[in-house]
């Protein structure tokens, strides 16, 4: 025998108090799948959490963080304090990147400058706490006998640290 509740679509619940008919989810609740016997309470984005997507009868609200903070955890369950570019967040708060490392974002860790010599290149622009070095042509290309200078390689785009 087929469960009559299986006919209830997302956005409704199977109401046992009304002969198992499909009733719409009450305000501030949702059901994202069919056949539900209850609707789930919508997440409320309060305080440091801002509403990124409003709750609907079929999907939960989604939150992000107010400026100065960024999301951590599944579904933005926490908001972590931003630092400035050129810093990283440590157990003792925001600290400047050590010499030879950089961070071009307000979150994540300081990473080592690119070692241009590993690719046989020279340093065209020195690195800073906020920016990676820019590697230029190899030293051989810069010798007086070289007929042409190859254009400098673009600075590598640092990967984003995982959220």
């Amino acid at each position: 025998l087929q469960d009559p509740c299986s006919n209830c679509p997302a956005g409704t619940f199977c109401d046992n108090n009304r002969n198992q008919i499909c009733s719409p989810c009450p305000p501030n609740s949702f059901s994202s799948a069919g056949g539900q016997r209850t609707c789930d309470i919508c997440r409320q984005c309060k305080g440091v959490f801002r509403t990124r997507k409003e709750c609907s009868s079929t999907s939960n609200a989604e939150c992000d963080c107010t400026p100065g903070f960024h999301c951590l955890g599944a579904g933005c369950s926490m908001c972590e304090q931003d630092c400035k570019q050129g810093q990283e967040l440590t157990k003792k708060g925001c600290k400047d990147c050590c010499f030879g490392t950089f961070n071009d974002q307000k979150r994540g860790i300081c990473r080592p400058w690119t070692n241009c010599s590993l690719d046989g290149k020279s340093v065209l622009v020195n690195g800073t706490k906020e920016r990676d070095v820019v590697c230029g042509p190899s030293p051989a290309d810069l010798s007086p006998g070289a007929s042409s200078v190859t254009p400098p390689a673009p600075a590598r785009e640092p990967g984003h640290s995982p959220q």
């Epitope: 369950s77 926490m78 908001c79 972590e80 304090q81 157990k91 708060g93």
Partner: nanobody, 124 residues
Framework: QVQLVESGGGLVQPGGSLRLSCSAS????????MSWVRQAPGKGLEWVSD????????FYEDSVKGRFTISRDNAKNTLYLQMNSLRAEDTAVYYC?????????????????WGQGTLVTVSS
């Protein structure tokens, strides 16, 4: 071990003021966000306010904005809640709570330590 001890509750008339304190020990207080949460008689827990680790970012439940002020003294390991223009509906047990990760504000479900609470009664 982590300890949070609230004080400052009591009976106050509508329109009056109270200042709650929460004395913290057993962890590096200055590295953690803190919160006030309340529970009215017969009701569920309600988030009231958050403050970040340094005290420069504060957040409030809509119903207390402009009336309550959260603050902290990291040198004294103490969290405060200044409550002005109190109303009957502010009657509740007020709890202070610690957030689980350094320099991070979590949702109420994730707070890892709570005080025992202090009762605030607003009545004429």
């Amino acid at each position: 071990q982590v300890q949070l001890v609230e004080s400052g509750g009591g009976l106050v008339q509508p329109g009056g003021s109270l200042r709650l304190s929460c004395s913290a020990s057993g962890f590096t207080f200055s590295s953690y966000a803190m919160s006030w949460v309340r529970q009215a008689p017969g009701k569920g827990l309600e988030w009231v306010s958050d403050i970040n680790s340094g005290g420069e970012s504060t957040f409030y439940e809509d119903s207390v904005k402009g009336r309550f002020t959260i603050s902290r003294d990291n040198a004294k390991n103490t969290l405060y809640l200044q409550m002005n223009s109190l109303r009957a509906e502010d009657t509740a047990v007020y709890y202070c709570a610690k957030h689980p990760l350094t320099y991070t504000i979590a949702t109420m479900n994730d707070y890892d330590y709570w005080g025992q609470g202090t009762l605030v009664t607003v009545s004429s």
